[in-house]
């Protein structure tokens, strides 16, 4: 029978800068029942506080509701593990809510094949930002990424859409059924999960030659951009 091993706070996430949750990994329990508590103080403050809600985020978590969340303060937190033989503390973690935002996936993904008479056919993709995000305040800039692939293909084709909530894609295989998904991230945060897949059947007469595949931004309203490997790496840095 031993004191508990050192716990580790391994993740903090906020869906919208208004609330956030942190999770920890227990260390070894020393063969005894172990209690965990998370304590914190904020930058410029020496008064210590305890986690306000150990329930909402599930086991080994601390949830900070609206009345405990401030964008303008760094939180300095640690977890204490205690059993009959003693205590151990995690390392301190510094948390700035601005940098831990992971939004919900975008909503209302709609995909449509457009075949205008006077122009090349294209796939039109449209979506809405997640409901928890209030873009009107100006606190948020959301960036979007689309991925699509034929149903039986292994590799996804990825397109970066910037801040737009619609996108056009021209280079598709006729007669194939495609899966389309979209995700988002704030300028200083983490990518959301991908939205549920939407399926679209590409008509057999959706044809174009190779010269048509490279189309100017002007033609597309600036909506399709070629992305370098470096860009992709940057957009996936979280």
């Amino acid at each position: 029978q031993l004191p508990p091993g050192k716990p580790e706070i391994f993740k903090c996430r906020s869906p919208n800068k208004e609330t956030f949750t942190c999770w920890w990994r227990p260390g070894t329990d020393g063969g005894l029942p172990t209690n965990y508590s998370l304590t914190y103080h904020r930058e410029g403050e020496t008064l210590m506080h305890e986690c306000p809600d150990y329930i909402t985020g599930g086991p080994n978590s601390c949830h900070f509701g609206k009345q405990y969340t401030s964008m303008w303060r760094t939180y300095i937190m640690m977890v204490n593990a205690t059993n009959q033989m003693g205590s151990s503390f995690s390392d301190e973690l510094y948390v700035d809510v601005t940098y831990i935002v992971q939004p919900d996936p975008p909503l209302e993904l709609a995909v449509e094949v457009k075949q205008p008479e006077d122009r090349k056919p294209y796939l039109w993709i449209k979506w809405s930002p997640p409901t928890l995000i209030d873009l009107k305040t100006g606190w948020f800039t959301l960036l979007y990424e689309i991925r699509l692939k034929p149903e039986k293909a292994a590799e996804w084709e990825i397109h970066f859409a910037g801040q737009q909530t619609e996108f056009k894609i021209l280079s598709l295989h006729p007669g194939q059924k495609y899966l389309v998904q979209v995700r988002c991230k704030p300028d200083h945060g983490y990518w959301s999960a991908w939205s549920p897949a939407t399926f679209i059947q590409i008509p057999s007469d959706f044809t174009m030659n190779d010269e048509q595949k490279l189309i100017s931004e002007e033609d597309l309203g600036g909506e399709q951009k070629l992305i370098s490997e470096e860009d992709l790496h940057h957009h996936h840095h979280h």
Partner: antibody, heavy 118, light 107 residues
Amino acid sequence: EVHLVESGGGLVQPGGSLRLSCAASGFTFSSYEMNWVRQTPGKGLEWISHISSRSVIIYYADSVKGRFTISRDNAKNSLFLQMNSLRAEDTAVYFCAGITIFGIPEYWGQGTLVTVSS
Amino acid sequence: EIVLTQSPATLSLSPGERATLSCRASQSVSSYFAWYQQKPGQAPRLLIYDASSRATGIPTRFSGSGSGTDFTLTISSLEPEDFAVYYCQQRSSWPITFGQGTRLEIK
């Protein structure tokens, strides 16, 4: 609607003991930091004790340290202050206060009067 | 402990006038700072927290400013119900402390 109702005040002789209670309703008591604050005509408002959501963090003012004990029962939405070795200078109205916004107490009870006199 | 000094001790003004109350801390409290209003026989009522944020239900005529050691509560146009005692408070460090109060009275 939030309610904090203190009870247990009264007249006690110097050296005596009292136990104050605060019954909370209208909010998730178990999530909130709770406090006892007292007010005397001479000293104004004095923050005397603070207890965190699961009693992990407890603070006392030097003027009451070793004599007063704060505790809470989250199952019963209740806050307590056990006051021993009371002195004349402990005479005051005692308020319980719930912290709701970044550690600022927004909810206060109406207070209970404690008089220490022989 | 951090000592808070309020000035003036008493402020005599008429309804409709602007009130400016000051509070100075003996050391920096960042912006962990609040203002309370108290009327006779009542508990203190939170007006401003984090130096400049209005608490729920507080009229817009109340505003707070300052950080570090110097803080101000401004009431832009006094209403009859604003005449009361006002306390500043720091909760940057334990013990949490209050100022001695400013009495705002009708002239």
